[in-house]
């Protein structure tokens, strides 16, 4: 058995077979080039379809696998923290937030009350906090990531709120809505100093920020355009205005991802001039979200990343670089603004 | 705007291959997403989806026609074929096209061509 | 592959009333993977909703869908004359995609 000596030089799993000797990976791990080694990819994307949340490795040529996940329905919105390699997802047919670690294993449901359309999502990691979005209740709320602590912070006026982004460092949510005027909003990330950023845009989705380059991106369902502004909403630009049916949308160093309904695709161009473009994976009917799994999209420093900002329960960023401890429903704050009480 | 119309013979024997053509105008298949999809109805009966074809030449068949049917497209005609082998009876229906604007939804449908199968 | 079962078979009704049309798979079929149809008798199909609750270019507001899982309907708040057809649900969450056996809304 070649397996025997020296593991057939293999990094990780050595297969013997009659056709001969082949490496394999565990998973969450990915064979490179020269058939032998496993690494962790360093980046790759995540998507969403249907019962399914697959990724595609941007390094290596091995795409389009299923991670292991049992239960799953509907998968609709996405998102992941990099210190734990966890993945979450909201399920609009069973109503829930989940979360599992990259390999499949410790599923479990982090949210599974309250919620109708939780359609965005998105994850707080320097808080470790989740943001959702649900277009049913009409509400914005946050919990802890393991789904304790849960306060509804925007609720007034809200009008079909569906794509969310976060920007920890800076203190901002951002979120665009689908009612009856399409928009895209910003408010510090308790809630509170709400405002209108796009307001003549059409159902926006695939709401994504460029940290690096302070941009925002999203596709927009009314005019099929992939659009970009600053963080304040101005400098706008078209990056792609001859798409069908782009849909959801993510960003990664030079370029922007995204899917495209009629298409049946996957694809990425230059984030500035939408030059360039690739068809990362074909054949998908109905990607709902996508993400790129990365580090680099997950850096930054606030108060909240130190100890909690010594919040007992919620410690939510605030601009410019500050943040508020917040309760629970039905908590209240005591005057030493650190603690909560029970009702 | 969208338009598509099926062309083919009226009467088939039984064992013959049948061969419509769908010709559209409004659209394209070239890169801009999209399909075109065959369905059948039988007299009085429910509709049946056959098969589509997409933009990038992804094809689809239904599981119980699938060993007897064959699509493609000639994208610089705008046309669309399908070919049904062993045609029997039971086969005899108004076939229609239609535009896969959407993944398996159909927004555009041509007028149908009914097809009678009879010795 | 998926049956959907349509129900009732007729509906008799007049001008002006609500009309409910009902639609279950015989499995889960997620809330935005169903489409609704409208046929008159030597026409072909139109296109009314797609996505379960999207609403087709052009189809009238008294047109509605809802429903998620195994249960839709599809709601015609007040009959208009030409609004008296055969309609058929198709499910395209899993392939093959199919559909109903149609319900007609014939007038009273």
């Known amino acids: 058995n070649p397996c025997a000596e020296e593991n057939g030089g293999c990094s990780h799993l050595c297969l013997y077979r009659p056709q001969g000797l082949r490496c394999a990976c565990p998973i969450g791990f990915e064979l490179i080039s020269d058939m032998k080694t496993c690494i962790v990819p360093e980046a790759f994307l995540l998507f969403s379809r249907r019962a399914d949340i697959r990724r595609i490795s941007l390094e290596t040529n091995n795409n389009n696998v299923a991670i292991p996940l049992t239960g799953v329905k509907e998968a609709s919105a996405l998102d992941f923290d990099v210190t734990d390699n966890r993945i979450y997802w909201t399920d609009i047919s069973l109503k829930t937030i989940s979360r599992a670690f990259m390999n499949g294993s410790a599923l479990e449901h982090v949210v599974e009350f309250g919620l109708d359309y939780p359609e965005g999502m998105a994850v707080d990691w320097l808080g470790k906090n989740l943001y959702w979005a649900d277009t049913g209740t009409n509400r914005i709320e946050v919990s802890k990531l393991d789904g304790q602590h849960r306060q509804v912070l925007v609720w007034k006026d809200l009008d079909s709120p569906r794509a969310l982004a976060l920007d920890p460092a800076e203190g901002f949510m951002y979120w665009t809505e689908w009612g009856g005027k399409p928009k895209i909003d910003r408010a510090a990330m308790d809630g509170s100093e709400r405002t209108t950023l796009v307001p003549n845009v059409g159902r926006a989705n695939g709401l994504t920020i460029d940290y690096a380059k302070r941009r925002l991106y999203w596709t927009d369902l009314d005019t099929n355009l992939i659009e970009s502004s600053n963080m304040l909403g101005l400098n706008r630009e078209v990056i792609a205005d001859d798409l069908p049916h782009p849909f959801g949308l993510t960003q990664y160093q030079d370029y922007i991802y995204w899917t495209d309904w009629s298409r049946r695709s996957i694809e990425r161009a230059n984030k500035t001039s939408g030059q360039n473009r690739t068809i990362i994976q074909g054949h998908l009917d109905y990607v709902m979200d996508i993400l790129v799994f990365h580090s680099s999209r997950q850096s930054g420093w606030n108060e909240c990343a130190s100890s909690n900002g010594h919040c007992s329960h919620l410690c939510l960023a605030v601009p410019v670089g500050g943040f508020v401890c917040g309760c629970p429903a039905h908590y209240s704050l005591n005057a030493d603004n650190r603690t909560c009480s029970a009702p | 705007q969208v338009q598509l119309k099926e062309s083919g013979p009226a009467l088939v024997k039984p064992t013959q291959t049948l061969t419509l053509t769908c010709t559209f105008s409004?659209?394209?298949?070239?890169?801009?997403?999209?399909?075109v999809g065959w369905f059948r109805q039988p007299p009085g009966k429910a509709l049946e989806w056959l098969a589509w074809?997409?933009?990038?030449?992804?094809?689809s068949y239904s599981t119980s026609l699938k060993t007897r049917l064959t699509i493609s497209k000639d994208t610089s005609k705008n046309q669309v074929v399908l070919t049904m082998t062993n045609m029997d009876p039971v086969d005899t229906a108004t076939y229609y096209c239609?535009?896969?604007?959407?993944?398996?939804?159909?927004?555009?449908w041509g007028q149908g061509t009914l097809v009678t199968v009879s010795s | 592959d998926i049956v959907l079962t349509q129900s009732p078979a007729t509906l008799s009704l007049s001008p002006g009333e609500r009309a409910t049309l009902s639609c279950r798979a015989s499995q889960f079929i997620g809330s935005r993977y169903l489409a609704w149809y409208q046929q008159k008798p030597g026409q072909a199909p139109r296109l009314l909703i797609y996505?379960?609750?999207n609403r087709a270019t052009g189809v009238p507001a008294r047109f509605s869908g809802s429903g998620s899982g195994t249960d839709f309907t599809l709601t015609i708040s007040s009959l208009e004359p030409e609004d008296f057809a055969t309609y058929y649900c198709?499910?395209?969450?899993?392939?093959?995609?199919?559909f109903g056996q149609g319900t007609k809304v014939e007038i009273k």
């Open positions: 239609a535009r896969m604007h959407l993944p398996l939804v159909f927004d555009s």
């Open positions: 409004g659209f394209s298949l070239s890169n801009r997403g999209g399909g």
């Open positions: 996505g379960a609750s």
């Open positions: 074809i997409d933009w990038d030449d992804d094809k």
């Open positions: 198709q499910q395209y969450y899993d392939y093959p995609q199919t």
